[in-house]
Interface confidence: low
C-alpha cells in the first residue's frame, strides 16, 4: 500500500505528461489527481513508465471508481490493461467493438490470458449472442477462440456468423463443437451453389451426417483426405465403396496411405472385400466374399 | 511385371487427329485410374488427362479441354487418348501412366509431331 | 511457369547429399501428398518417393521425401554417378482440379 504523504511543493501535475516519469511512486500518489488521469488516459501509453508507477496509477483509477471503470477509461487502458485482475475486469460493462479491440491489441501476439477470457465473456455476455463483428474480431486475435467454446456457448452463435469463421479457426475444435457448428454453416451457406458451397462447408464437416455426405457425393467435390480424415466415424461408416470413391475424387488413393486409421480402418471393416478391390488400391480387411451381412443397429432399432 | 505401351503416334498437320492407345499388361486394368502425361522436346512433364477405373470420371488439363477426350476399353485392357484440332504446342512425347495421384508406372512415350 | 516451383539445377560431387526443393501452395502440396519423380537422359519417368515420403520397392534408401506445409523436398546422400537425371515433384491441385508438376530440376554429379 503507498502511504499517503503531501504532494511536494510544486509537482502538483496540471497534465499527464512525460515529466511523471521522474516521479518516484509515493510523488505519483500524491500529485496525480485520478479525475485528471481516468479523462487523460488516452495519454499513458505513449509514456514509459515503468511497471511500479503503473501499479500507481491503476491503485488511483481503482479509488476512483471501486464499482468498476467507466467505459471512456476502459477503451483508453493501453498497457495499463496488463495490470488488471480477471476480478477487476468482472466489475465492467464493455459494450464497444472499438473498447474490445483496442484492449486485445495490447494483448496481440500472446496466449489469451486469463484476463482477455474475462473480458470476452463479459462482453459478449453483454451482447446476448455472439455476432459476427465480435466473432470477426476475436478470431482475428485468436484463431482458436471458437474452439474454446463449450458446445452450450456455441449454441448462441448465429448463423449469420458463420460466414466470419476461417478453416483455421476450427483446426482444434473437437467433434462435440462441430456437431453444434455444422449445422449452422449448412444454414448460413444453403444459397450457394456447388463448388462455392463446399469450399466453405470443408471445414465444418466434422459435423456432417451421413445423408449429408451422401448428397456430397453426388456432386463431384472431391474431397481431400485431410477433410475425410476428420469426418465423424459413425457418419463415414454407412458410406458404401462408390460413395467413398465419389466424395474423394481424385484423392481415393490416399486412403490407402491412411488404411490404419480411423476413420478408414474402420469404414474398410465394414466394407465387402470384392467391392473394396474395385478401387485397385489394395485395401484389405474387408468382409470375405461370400459372408453375410448383418447390421445390427438395424436388428437393435427393429427389437 | 507391369507393362504399359503406347502406340499410334506420328506426324499431323494443324488442326489435324490423332488416336493415342495405351496397351497395359500385368495388372489388373480394370482396377486402377489411368492417366496420359506429356513432354515436350527438351521441356518438363505436363500432366494431360486421367480417367477413373470404371470410366465414370475424367479430368482434364486446361490446355486441352474440349479438344481431347479420354477413354478406355476395359474389356481389351487399353487406354485411347484421342486428340483433335491439334496445334504446334501439342507437338511432345505422350506417356501413358497406372494411377491418378502418384504415376507409379509409366510406357515408354510415344511422339507426336505436329507441323505442316 | 510451373504451378510448383523447383530450382531448374543442383549440383554434388560423388559421396556428398543434395536436396531439392519444390513449393506450392495449401491447394496442392499443403492438402496432397506430393509424389517425386526422376527421368534419367532419354527416358521416360520412374517413380521415386509417393505420399510424400515412401519409397516404392526397389528404390534405395539414399533417396527421401519430406514435406511441411506447402514445401516438400527431396534428399540424396551418397550421391553417384548414375543419379545424374531430372528430378519432377508432383501433386493434385484442389483449386484446378488438376495435377501438377514442378518444373523440373537437372541434377548434376560433378
Known amino acids: 500500500e503507498v502511504e499517503k504523504t503531501a504532494c511536494p511543493s510544486g509537482k502538483k501535475a496540471r497534465e499527464i505528461d512525460e515529466s511523471l516519469i521522474f516521479y518516484k511512486k509515493w510523488e505519483l500518489e500524491a500529485c496525480v489527481d485520478a479525475a485528471l488521469l481516468a479523462t487523460q488516459m488516452d495519454r499513458v501509453n505513449a509514456i514509459p513508465f515503468t511497471y511500479e508507477q503503473l501499479d500507481v496509477l491503476k491503485h488511483k483509477l481503482d479509488e476512483l471508481y471501486p464499482q468498476g471503470y467507466p467505459e471512456s477509461v476502459i477503451q483508453h487502458l493501453g498497457y495499463l490493461f496488463l495490470k488488471m485482475s480477471p476480478e477487476d475486469i468482472r466489475k465492467w460493462n464493455v459494450t464497444s467493438l472499438e473498447t474490445l479491440k483496442a484492449l486485445l491489441e495490447v494483448n496481440k501476439g500472446h496466449e489469451m490470458s486469463p484476463q482477455v477470457a474475462t473480458l470476452i465473456d463479459r462482453f459478449v455476455k453483454g451482447r446476448g449472442q455472439l455476432d459476427k463483428d465480435t466473432l470477426d474480431t476475436l478470431t482475428a486475435f485468436y484463431p482458436g477462440y471458437l474452439c474454446s467454446l463449450s458446445p452450450e456457448e456455441l449454441s448462441s452463435v448465429p448463423p449469420s456468423s458463420i460466414w466470419a469463421v476461417r478453416p483455421q479457426d476450427l483446426d482444434t475444435c473437437d467433434p462435440r463443437q462441430l456437431d453444434v457448428l455444422y449445422p449452422k454453416a449448412r444454414l448460413a451457406f444453403q444459397n450457394m451453389n456447388g463448388s462455392e458451397y463446399f469450399v466453405k462447408i470443408q471445414s465444418f464437416l466434422g459435423g456432417a451426417p451421413t445423408e449429408d455426405l451422401k448428397a456430397l457425393s453426388q456432386q463431384n467435390v472431391s474431397m481431400d483426405l485431410a477433410t475425410f480424415m476428420k469426418l465423424r466415424t459413425d457418419a463415414v461408416l454407412p458410406l458404401t465403396v462408390a460413395e467413398v470413391q465419389k466424395l474423394l475424387g481424385p484423392h481415393v488413393e490416399g486412403l490407402k496411405a491412411e488404411e490404419r486409421h480411423r476413420p478408414v480402418r474402420d469404414w474398410i471393416l465394414r466394407q465387402r472385400q470384392d467391392d473394396l478391390d474395385t478401387l485397385g488400391l489394395g485395401l484389405q480387411g474387408g468382409i470375405p466374399n461370400g459372408y453375410l451381412v448383418l447390421d445390427l443397429s438395424m436388428q437393435e432399432a427393429l427389437s | 511385371e507391369v507393362q504399359l505401351l503406347e502406340s499410334g503416334g506420328g506426324l499431323v498437320q494443324p488442326g489435324g487427329s490423332l488416336r493415342l492407345s495405351c496397351a497395359a499388361s500385368?495388372?489388373?486394368?480394370?482396377?486402377?485410374?489411368m492417366s496420359w502425361v506429356r513432354q515436350a522436346p527438351g521441356k518438363g512433364l505436363e500432366w494431360v488427362s486421367s480417367?477413373?477405373?470404371?470410366?465414370?470420371?475424367?479430368y482434364y488439363a486446361d490446355s486441352v479441354k474440349g479438344r481431347f477426350t479420354i477413354s478406355r476399353d476395359n474389356s481389351k485392357n487399353t487406354l485411347y487418348l484421342q486428340m483433335n484440332s491439334l496445334r504446334a504446342e501439342d507437338m511432345a512425347v505422350y506417356y501413358c501412366?497406372?494411377?491418378?495421384?502418384?504415376?507409379?508406372?509409366w510406357g515408354q512415350g510415344t511422339l507426336v509431331t505436329v507441323s505442316s | 511457369q510451373s504451378v510448383l516451383t523447383q530450382p531448374p539445377s543442383a549440383s554434388g560431387p560423388p559421396g556428398q547429399r543434395v536436396t531439392i526443393s519444390c513449393t506450392g501452395s495449401?491447394?496442392?502440396?499443403?492438402?496432397?501428398?506430393v509424389s517425386w519423380y526422376q527421368q534419367l537422359p532419354g527416358t521416360a519417368p520412374k517413380l521415386l518417393i509417393y505420399?510424400?515420403?515412401h519409397r516404392p520397392s526397389g528404390v534405395p534408401d539414399r533417396f527421401s521425401g519430406s514435406k511441411s506445409g506447402t514445401s516438400a523436398s527431396l534428399a540424396i546422400g551418397g550421391l553417384r554417378s548414375e543419379d545424374e537425371a531430372d528430378y519432377y515433384c508432383?501433386?493434385?491441385?484442389?483449386?484446378?482440379?488438376?495435377?501438377?508438376f514442378g518444373g523440373g530440376t537437372k541434377l548434376t554429379v560433378l
Open positions: 505420399y510424400d515420403s
Open positions: 501412366a497406372k494411377n491418378l495421384l502418384t504415376f507409379d508406372y
Open positions: 500385368g495388372f489388373t486394368f480394370s482396377n486402377y485410374a
Open positions: 480417367i477413373y477405373p470404371n470410366g465414370s470420371s475424367k
Open positions: 508432383g501433386a493434385w491441385d484442389d483449386s484446378l482440379n488438376a495435377y501438377v
Open positions: 495449401s491447394s496442392n502440396i499443403g492438402n496432397n501428398s
